[in-house]
Amino acid sequence: HPSPAPPDQLNTSSAESELWEPGERLPVRLTNGSSSCSGTVEVRLEASWEPACGALWDSRAAEAVCRALGCGGAEAASQLAPPTPELPPPPAAGNTSVAANATLAGAPALLCSGAEWRLCEVVEHACRSDGRRARVTCAENRALRLVDGGGACAGRVEMLEHGEWGSVCDDTWDLEDAHVVCRQLGCGWAVQALPGLHFTPGRGPIHRDQVNCSGAEAYLWDCPGLPGQHYCGHKEDAGAVCSEHQSWRLTGGADRCEGQVEVHFRGVWNTVCDSEWYPSEAKVLCQSLGCGTAVERPKGLPHSLSGRMYYSCNGEELTLSNCSWRFNNSNLCSQSLAARVLCSASRSLHNLSTPEVPASVQTVTIESSVTVKIENKESRELMLL
């Protein structure tokens, strides 16, 4: 099948609430519950999560939240008593206004005109913030994830069913199937649908075989298919790489640990804008590539690729995608050069024939932008044909 056409996209970042990424459903989560599919409803407002107002919580919103989280329908929607005493009654006529403080500290509500997440809206300051909180218990504890691909948007496909994480067999696995996975996870669209052994094999049960999505399904478990049963082994675990997955390489240097910083994102390689490229960003990149630590940030050259990516790290992140990042889709880096870095494991520093790479878990970026982890002491080069 041809790859689904990427949707037109606006500028995006790692901490955005107004513009939802392709495939992202609702900026909601459930906390303090018995599973990821029950608990107090919280909505994302800019950089923080706030409890959703219980006074305006209804069955439509509960149904939409459960569906958006891949948890089936809603089994029970309720309100949690507030942590503080109940609200006072409306003020008697003639009393001084008490709105000043309560108004500004209003709680957000999730308002839905139907039971589908597309019909929902987060409305800020919709309720008195010391009122009841929305709670929901969803019917199914189902979930989906991508594992061992160097980020949440690439890796081996795993489904949670009956309390157990398991794989999906790669028989008939194609871009339409991967597209459903990517969209469900808020990871954009599918760049690659990968057969077994591109990522480390799974260990649990194999939940699905002969998956045959049209590409329009909201959840992977809505796609036609067979139970995993006995016909597949973990050498046939399906994988996916989504457009929102980021992988990195250094080019134009003495080896893979030195050069111009390039990120594969949304199907193309991009240079990184050096206007926000500091030691903390360089350190995270060198470490994530298994190249030691950053030694210097050589002066950049003009962008040889479209330069649209900015990163801001504190230096403790595992990869650059864990940092705050910004992808400017409409403008190239203004008045900046392409970021470069020299890592401590580069042979241009050590005059070694091969760079020193940590032996435990090595992150390898391979052609076509798939990032995998190889858990042995030998360095192996993987190529996708």
């Epitope: 305006l56 609200l87 206004s97 008490v98 709105a99 309560a102 108004t103 300051h125 919709a126 309720c127």
Partner: nanobody
Framework: QVQLVESGGGLVQPGGSLRLSCSAS????????LGWFRQAPGKEREFVAA????????YYADSVKGRFTISRDNSKNTLYLQMNSLRAEDTAVYYC????????????????WGKGTLVTVSS
């Protein structure tokens, strides 16, 4: 007791505009979230639009989004509903509502109702 009095209803042609007002007797007007509901002949009462205490947050029914605008003037104790591109299906009695605890999107949170003003859209 908050008294809500609607005005501005009337007969208008399809595609036309009307502005409804709702004045409140209550001096603590700004303590209430406000909204509009409507009831067409033979139909159930339905939510139209709501606005929070300070007017910073609004919410609309899908059927009126992009055509109706809710606003409030706390200094005048008045709520407004600007209705543009009116359609025959907008014909209804429009009720002003006030709520203390939450924006009046669902009927169970509403503390006070006005008596209503009739809007008729017909050629």
């Amino acid at each position: 007791q908050v008294q809500l009095v609607e005005s501005g209803g009337g007969l208008v042609q399809p595609g036309g505009s009307l502005r409804l007002s709702c004045s409140a007797s209550e001096r603590t007007f700004s303590d209430y979230a406000l909204g509009w509901f409507r009831q067409a002949p033979g139909k159930e009462r339905e939510f139209v639009a709501a606005i929070n205490w300070v007017g910073g947050s609004t919410y609309y029914a899908d059927s009126v989004k992009g055509r109706f605008t809710i606003s409030r003037d706390n200094s005048k104790n008045t709520l407004y509903l600007q209705m543009n591109s009116l359609r025959a299906e907008d014909t209804a009695v429009y009720y002003c509502v006030a709520s203390w605890g939450a924006m009046p999107v669902l009927t169970h949170v509403i503390n006070y109702w006005g008596k209503g003003t009739l809007v008729t859209v017909s050629s």
